[in-house]
């Protein structure tokens, strides 16, 4: 029983340290983000940025991501499309 408790304690400590290291690693990776808005049904991110989300005008909730850098709002007669664009900054 003592051995089991010791193993559990060690495992817990490993988890704590690992979790802390992962958190620090994630924290040190900065995300640079910007928003792009276009008239019509497409909005494109600059080079090096990836689409992380899209928004559509005319209360349209149907969209997809094209060629990795472009938001496409799928409703007819779209008046505007927005893209949230992010890239990792070490």
């Amino acid at each position: 029983k003592t051995l089991c408790s010791m193993e559990e304690a060690i495992n817990e400590r490993i988890q704590e340290v690992a979790g802390s290291l992962i958190f620090r690693a994630i924290s040190s990776i900065g995300l640079e983000c910007q928003s792009v808005t276009s008239r019509g049904d497409l909005a494109t991110c600059p080079r090096g940025f990836a689409v992380t989300g899209c928004t559509c005008g005319s209360a349209c909730g149907s969209w997809d991501v094209r060629a990795e850098t472009t938001c496409h709002c799928q409703c007819a007669g779209m008046d505007w499309t927005g893209a949230r664009c992010c890239r990792v900054q070490p």
Partner: antibody, heavy 117, light 110 residues
């Protein structure tokens, strides 16, 4: 190495149909738009339209909408530009170009189309 | 769809600097900082020289630079060399997610 290999020169008569091709290699074909650009010899460049090879969603310049059709076959990494009824004014060099974000980064060598009776 | 306005021709002597302008509207050049510039030698396909207004692709000489003010973008070539003689085209993404080109500028190196 990114390459866009275009089909050879064509000589056609007015009213005939035509499809020219552009095969992409050296990159993931479905991750980039393919654009078509027209150049009448001795004149400037005109953007015709672009297509997403993933599902062939196309966007056209108002100047070319309805006169040409842009399509792709992603299984063979190839894009196409097609006319149902050619006119003499379609005589030009046609470039296929990879679109990366806001710019056109890799160009094919062009296909010369001559339409003459 | 109207093209962007470029001078038909410019010229300069080796070693000099030249600037080519590209004027559009608030719906294209002025609406985005996403003007690109292309060089085309006779009988060849165009080549991307500047993207996103002022950035150079790898392999393009730092003698080429781009800028923008309002609805006008500019390409500057410094230390002009014989091999720079070519046609230059500006292009802008538009607020309708289409692209438009300038009419082209013929650069002559005297």
């Amino acid at each position: 190495e990114v390459q866009l290999v275009q089909s050879g020169a064509e000589v056609k008569k007015p009213g005939e149909s035509l499809r020219i091709s552009c095969k992409g290699s050296g990159y993931t074909f479905t991750n980039y738009w393919i654009n078509w650009v027209r150049q009448v010899p001795g004149k400037g460049l005109e953007w015709m339209g672009m297509i997403d090879p993933t599902d062939s969603y196309a966007k056209y310049s108002p100047s070319f909408q309805g006169h040409v059709t842009i399509s792709t076959d992603k299984s063979v990494s190839t894009a196409y530009l097609q006319w149902r009824s050619l006119q003499a004014s379609d005589s030009a060099i046609y470039y296929c170009v990879r679109g990366y974000s806001y710019d056109l980064d890799y160009w094919g060598k062009g296909t010369l189309v001559t339409v003459s009776s | 769809q109207s093209v962007l306005t470029q001078p038909a021709s410019v010229s300069g002597s080796p070693g000099q600097s030249i600037t080519i302008s590209c004027t559009g509207t608030s719906s294209d050049v002025g609406g985005y900082n996403y003007v690109s510039w292309y060089q085309q030698h006779p009988g060849k396909a165009p080549k991307l020289m500047i993207y996103e207004g002022s950035k150079r692709p790898s392999g393009v000489s730092n003698r080429f630079s781009g800028s923008k003010s309002g609805n006008t973008a500019s390409l500057t070539i410094s230390g002009l060399q014989a091999e720079d003689e070519a046609d230059y085209y500006c292009s802008s993404y538009t607020t309708r997610s289409t692209r438009v080109f300038g009419g082209g500028t013929k650069l002559t190196v005297l």
